[in-house]
């Protein structure tokens, strides 16, 4: 009884198509597959950023796989051939591993790379990224931002930089068609007359960095002798009502402060007849049904009621 063996895949490599972190892992079938013509060979692929605790594992019949990586770190991957038990009259047969690594050949000392990179997708409409120059760079250093997401043919450079003292310190992006709910890749690199500049890579999803506009049209309505309903309207723009959470801050007679988080555009407040003044502000954030994270909007303008009797009044700012 001869032991069944299979070779690992050939020409296993990680290919960088220039998409700032979205890489192709590709390979060729193993040598000497002739004995297994009737078999569907599978491949088990494992890959990770170097330093990561866990491997991502994929089993596929294809000769390629694509995924996103952090190019600030190296990448390692390994693959072996799997012969299913149907092909071997018994147990599954695995080849030895073929291994490969990839990393951007880095340049520059750490004091040259950008600091405090911050990106905000304002009102789910306008993306703006800003950064500080590296601690050790001179005014002759300029930074360039490139970005890519699935749907673009190639990485694009920022065309509208924000500048300070002649240096690029941010980017206003153009309209980004069909760019949410997918990885958005950014590279900030640079040039200087006297030293190489360290590149930095960033990946995020746009829906997770949305900062909405504040709510508008804040109103009061007396519901009963001891209840007031606070109402407001969703911020203007493309974000649907179902995507909002709100935080309210209510101040009664300059003393009691009530804060609450609600999912719709109303809040009912218990009051006493002694209430002389009532003020409230609201802010909005994209909720867990539409994103994994988000940024609170600025507070709305304050809406206040002052007076003797609220029983017959609806107050509209």
């Amino acid at each position: 009884d001869t032991e069944i063996k299979v070779n690992p895949p050939q020409d296993f490599e990680i290919v960088d198509p220039g998409y700032l972190g979205y890489l192709y892992l590709q390979w060729q079938p193993p040598l000497s597959l002739d004995h297994f013509k009737e078999c569907t060979v599978e491949y088990e692929l494992k890959y990770r950023n170097i330093g990561s605790e866990t491997w991502k594992t994929i089993i596929t019949k294809n000769l390629h796989y694509k995924d996103g990586f952090d190019l600030n770190k190296g990448i390692e991957a390994k693959i072996h051939t799997l012969l299913p038990w149907q092909c071997t009259n018994g147990s599954e047969v695995q080849s030895s591993w073929a291994e490969t690594t990839y990393w951007i050949s880095p340049q520059g000392i750490p004091e040259t790379k950008v600091q405090d990179m911050d990106c905000v997708y304002y009102n789910w409409q306008y993306l703006l990224c800003s950064w500080k120059p590296g601690i050790g760079v001179l005014l002759d250093t300029n930074y360039n931002l490139f970005y890519w997401y699935e749907g673009l043919d190639h990485a694009l450079q920022c065309v509208d930089y924000i500048k300070a003292d002649g240096q690029n310190i941010g980017c206003r992006f153009p309209y980004l068609e069909a760019s949410d709910y997918k990885d958005f890749y950014i590279c900030v690199n640079g040039s200087s007359e006297n030293k190489p500049i360290r590149s930095s890579y960033f990946t995020f999803q746009l829906q997770n960095i949305v900062k909405p506009l504040p709510p508008v049209y804040l109103t009061f309505t007396r519901e009963s002798s001891c209840e007031i309903k606070l109402k407001w309207s969703i911020p203007l723009g493309p974000i649907p009502a179902r995507c909002f959470d709100y935080e309210i801050e209510i101040r009664e007679d300059d003393t009691t402060l009530v804060t609450a988080t609600v999912e719709n555009e109303t809040y009912t407040l218990k009051t006493t007849n002694e209430t002389r003044q009532l003020c409230f502000v609201v802010r909005s954030k994209v909720n867990i049904y539409c994103s994994d994270d988000g940024i609170w909007s600025e507070w709305s303008d304050k809406q206040c009621w002052e007076g003797e009797d609220l029983s017959k009044k609806t107050l509209l700012r």
């Epitope: 000392i109 601690i135 050790g136």
Partner: antibody, heavy 118, light 107 residues
Framework: QVQLQQSGPEVVKPGASVKMSCKTS????????MHWVKQTHGRSLEWIGI????????NYNQKFKGRATMTVDKSSSTAYMQLRSLTSDDTAVYYC???????????WGQGTTVTVSS | DIQMTQSPSSLYASVGDRVTITCKAS??????LSWYQQKPGKAPKTLIY???RLVDGVPSRFSGSGSGQDYTLTISSLQYEDMGIYYC?????????FGAGTKVEIK
């Protein structure tokens, strides 16, 4: 040629402060950052922080943040480091060091010995 | 912070011996590693940068290798003047961190 000349030894009491200097020559002071490194018992080396003489920007090792202050005087091409609230653990040799465009460190001062003793 | 584990802490070798010192980083430092030699009462002197690039004027018996987390300094044929303490330094990110040093002594 490039030189980094550090101030002389200091003996100070616990709780006091010390300010040491690093006078540079042989290159344009504002074209390179300056780093400070602590060496204890002639063995262990610790990076304290970096200052950009061009704009005064700094980055401190968290361990020294709040107690170390790095400054520069562009007119005399001199870097300074002040250490406050000294304890016996601060007894060490302190070096200023300059990087090259591609690596750390191209040039070192001769070191300032600080002894904290009551 | 990135930790640098250097070994051995000291070694005795004869003139002409091949000497190897290793540094292991707690994470991938992408070859951002320098090696220094320090003699008593003197400031450290850079021998190697970017893991394997020899500084001008440093004898060719010194060489560096490694990538990822593991790095090595080799002295191919130890000379009397090579006595001293050797340190590695990672400069992938702030704060910069040094190895604890290897004291090289001649038998």
């Amino acid at each position: 040629q490039v030189q980094l000349q550090q101030s002389g030894p200091e003996v100070v009491k616990p709780g006091a402060s010390v300010k040491m200097s690093c006078k540079t020559s042989g290159y344009t002071f504002t074209e390179y950052t300056m780093h400070w490194v602590k060496q204890t018992h002639g063995r262990s080396l610790e990076w304290i922080g970096i200052i950009n003489p061009n704009n005064g920007g700094t980055n401190y090792n968290q361990k020294f943040k709040g107690r170390a202050t790095m400054t520069v005087d562009k007119s005399s091409s001199t870097a300074y480091m002040q250490l406050r609230s000294l304890t016996s653990d601060d007894t060490a040799v302190y070096y200023c060091a300059r990087p090259s465009a591609t690596h750390y460190f191209d040039y070192w001062g001769q070191g300032t010995t600080v002894t904290v003793s009551s | 912070d990135i930790q640098m584990t250097q070994s051995p802490s000291s070694l005795y070798a004869s003139v002409g011996d091949r000497v190897t010192i290793t540094c292991k980083a707690s994470q991938d430092i992408k070859s951002y590693l320098s090696w220094y030699q320090q003699k008593p009462g003197k400031a450290p002197k850079t021998l190697i940068y970017r893991a394997n690039r020899l500084v001008d004027g440093v004898p060719s018996r010194f060489s560096g290798s490694g990538s990822g987390q593991d790095y090595t300094l080799t002295i191919s044929s130890l000379q009397y003047e090579d006595m001293g303490i050797y340190y590695c330094l990672q400069y992938d990110e702030f704060p910069l961190t040094f190895g604890a040093g290897t004291k090289v002594e001649i038998k």
